[in-house]
């Protein structure tokens, strides 16, 4: 997955104190045993920093070497820094691991901007604040990179949680999560709660604060409120879904729904922004501008380049509209909607103005590779990647940032016809091109 705009994120102290969870509605369908309940050891196991990614602690090798690893649902390789780099405090030292096995094969991953390359091998991997298991997994030992690692981000590798089809060098390289499920009794499901701080955090605040939770093998009730609504995974490569309608402050964008998914729509924790196809982005920005027309902002702001600042505590959230994405439901002709607030799509930025100001970047941007539901979306919700049942669930996150007037929402059902027509079928000839990095 891609960097700069394609790496997240911010994290930290959520809208509600993490100890104070709102009660959950109980009208959900029952699940198979062992997949729900409390996963105390995994709650709050993510950290992160604005625009730089959410990471989990992992150990690799024997004896275990501890590394922070970026959680990325938009790629499928487990890749770690394995050579000195100016931005890395530590790296994977294969020669110190008695369990490392060399696969004698290289891997090269170019992005739109930047790249990494390395050597493939396998080793024993575990997640200290995850399931109590150790698995032998494929590891790409990154020996060279350009614009991949981020100065001050505090992570040293990337955990691609998507499917084998988009693994590099090819789909024969089994992704980490597939190995985990095959080798253990961990159910084929994980869930993510990414907690945006709502304000910028400095390095020490990041290290001391909570960035969210990755629950491996289950769903934790305490991390969401209300009901979970599921949308089918259209195809197992990226976590591809189908958007059937888009509304800005309740006003339908009225576009052919194929445009919303041109050429795909994916859920990607490794992208900061909500990224929209060109036509959709232009229509959405026009609508957001109209809704917030009592104040005008420069074009550079809408391009995600310039920051806009307000006196601390006076950000006029009320002038910015809510954005609703309607997703295909599990039942024929049924959809549900997820609604985000400006608190999600205006991203706090640090170190630019005085401490008397709150400054933000517009975190919706244009895409040439389809819709990307990045952190801007995910920070509003608890997102369940139910691989076993080929579906993704959304519920309102217990840590999302909101105000006293509006909250993020997951609501349904809505009647929507011909939803299958909303999916775009990528011509086979284009696919290899599309996978060489995402602009």
């Amino acid at each position: 997955t891609q960097h700069g705009i394609r790496l997240p994120l911010r994290s930290g102290l959520g809208g509600a104190p993490l100890g104070l969870r709102l009660p959950r509605e109980t009208d959900e369908e029952p699940e198979e045993p062992g997949r729900r309940g409390s996963f105390v050891e995994m709650v709050d196991n993510l950290r992160g920093k604005s625009g730089q990614g959410y990471y989990v602690e992992m150990t690799v090798g024997s004896p275990p070497q501890t590394l922070n690893i970026l959680v990325d649902t938009g790629s499928s390789n487990f890749a770690v820094g394995a050579a000195p780099h100016p931005f890395l405090h530590r790296y994977y030292q294969r020669q110190l691991s008695s369990t490392y096995r060399d696969l004698r094969k290289g891997v090269y991953v170019p992005y739109t901007q930047g790249k990494w390359e390395g050597e493939l091998g396998t080793d024993l991997v575990s997640i200290p604040h995850g399931p109590n298991v150790t698995v032998r997994a494929n590891i790409a030992a990154i020996t060279e990179s350009d614009k991949f690692f981020i100065n001050g981000s505090n992570w040293e590798g990337i955990l691609g949680l998507a499917y084998a089809e988009i693994a590099r060098p090819d789909d024969s390289l089994e992704p980490f999560f597939d190995s985990l499920v095959k080798q253990t009794h961990v159910p084929n499901l994980f869930s993510l709660q990414l907690c945006g701080a709502g304000f910028p955090l400095n390095q020490s605040e990041v290290l001391a604060s909570v960035g969210g939770s990755m629950i491996i093998g289950g769903i934790d009730h305490s991390l969401y409120t209300g009901s979970l609504w599921y949308t089918p995974i259209r195809r197992e490569w990226y976590y591809e879904v189908i958007i059937v309608r888009v509304e800005i402050n309740g006003q339908d964008l009225k576009m052919d729904c194929k445009e919303y998914n041109y050429d795909k729509s994916i859920v990607d924790s490794g992208t900061t922004n909500l990224r929209l196809p060109k036509k959709v982005f232009e229509a959405a920005v026009k609508s957001i501008k109209a809704a917030s027309s009592t104040e005008k902002f420069p074009d550079g702001f809408w391009l995600g380049e310039q920051l806009v600042c307000w006196q601390a505590g006076t950000t006029p959230w009320n002038i910015f509209p809510v954005i609703s994405l309607y997703l295909m439901g599990e039942v024929t002709n049924q959809s549900f909607r997820i609604t985000i607030l400006p608190q999600q799509y205006l991203r706090p930025v640090e170190d630019v103005a005085t401490s008397q100001d709150d400054c933000y970047k517009f975190a919706i941007s244009q895409s040439s590779t389809g819709t990307v539901m990045g952190a801007v979306i995910m920070e509003g919700f608890y997102v369940v990647f139910d691989r076993a049942r080929k579906r993704i669930g959304f519920a309102v996150s217990a840590c999302h940032v909101h105000d006293e007037f509006r909250t993020a929402a997951v609501e349904g059902p809505f009647v929507t016809l011909d939803m299958e027509d909303c999916g775009y079928n990528i011509p086979q000839t284009d696919e290899s091109t599309l996978m060489t990095g995402r602009a």
Partner: antibody, heavy 120, light 108 residues
Framework: QLQLQESGPGLVKPSETLSLTCTVS??????????WGWIRQPPGKGLEWIGN???????YYNPSLRGRVTISVDTSKNQFSLKLSSVTAADTAVYYC????????????WGRGTLVTVSS | EIVLTQSPATLSLSPGERATLSCRAS??????LAWFQQKPGQAPRLLIY???NRATGIPARFSGSGSGTDFTLTISSLEPEDFAVYYC??????????FGGGTKVEIK
């Protein structure tokens, strides 16, 4: 063509309120293409941004002056105004009104400026 | 807060010479930077916007370059009317608030 002209007293006593008006001629202040702003320049020194206003009344102020500064707009008179309270000698400056054009980014048209001296 | 540092403070040159003025930002401002010219007793005048675009009516001898943190205003051949004070201003953080301290171009 559009012109801006500052007006107001050239002498203000310490602790009083400085009041200036900028009259826009040659075009409507209610254009959606512009913000309107105030900048000042103490004698022999550099430029300091004071604040901006949109015709709807939306304002932005320099954090260093917040609490003392108020900018308002009167679309019927095609004017916008500056009030700076509790002035001291440090507020002695040439005060300019300007148009924030080029996509609300750059001060592309300026008034001639008016010198305001704070002295008893 | 983003600080703009202009150098040199004073530049002494003769008409016909090339003037190179520098503006350095304490952190990246992308290309959101303007240059203004101010003559004694006059209001500033916008010369360059978005780092390299000449404002309406500005002669071609004025050019701007740079992005990120380092910016340059070049006057290819100084005319007598070009002797003035030049200011840079960043608008990466909006509303535009920060001016540099100025560079005085004087006759040698």
């Amino acid at each position: 063509q559009l012109q801006l002209q500052e007006s107001g007293p050239g002498l203000v006593k310490p602790s009083e309120t400085l009041s200036l008006t900028c009259t826009v001629s040659g075009g409507p202040i209610s254009s959606s293409s512009y913000y309107w702003g105030w900048i000042r320049q103490p004698p022999g020194k550099g430029l300091e941004w004071i604040g901006n206003i949109y015709y709807s009344g939306s304002t932005y102020y320099n954090p260093s002056l917040r609490g003392r500064v108020t900018i308002s707009v009167d679309t019927s008179k095609n004017q916008f105004s500056l009030k700076l309270s509790s002035v001291t000698a440090a507020d002695t400056a040439v005060y300019y009104c300007a148009r924030l054009g080029h996509g609300y980014n750059y001060f592309d048209l300026w008034g001639r400026g008016t010198l305001v001296t704070v002295s008893s | 807060e983003i600080v703009l540092t202009q150098s040199p403070a004073t530049l002494s040159l003769s008409p016909g010479e090339r003037a190179t003025l520098s503006c350095r930002a304490s952190q990246s401002v992308s290309s959101y930077l303007a240059w203004f010219q101010q003559k004694p007793g006059q209001a500033p005048r916008l010369l360059i916007y978005d780092a390299s675009n000449r404002a309406t009516g500005i002669p071609a001898r004025f050019s701007g370059s740079g992005s990120g943190t380092d910016f340059t205003l070049t006057i290819s051949s100084l005319e007598p009317e070009d002797f003035a004070v030049y200011y840079c201003q960043q608008v990466y953080v909006w509303p535009p608030r920060t001016f540099g301290g100025g560079t005085k171009v004087e006759i040698k």
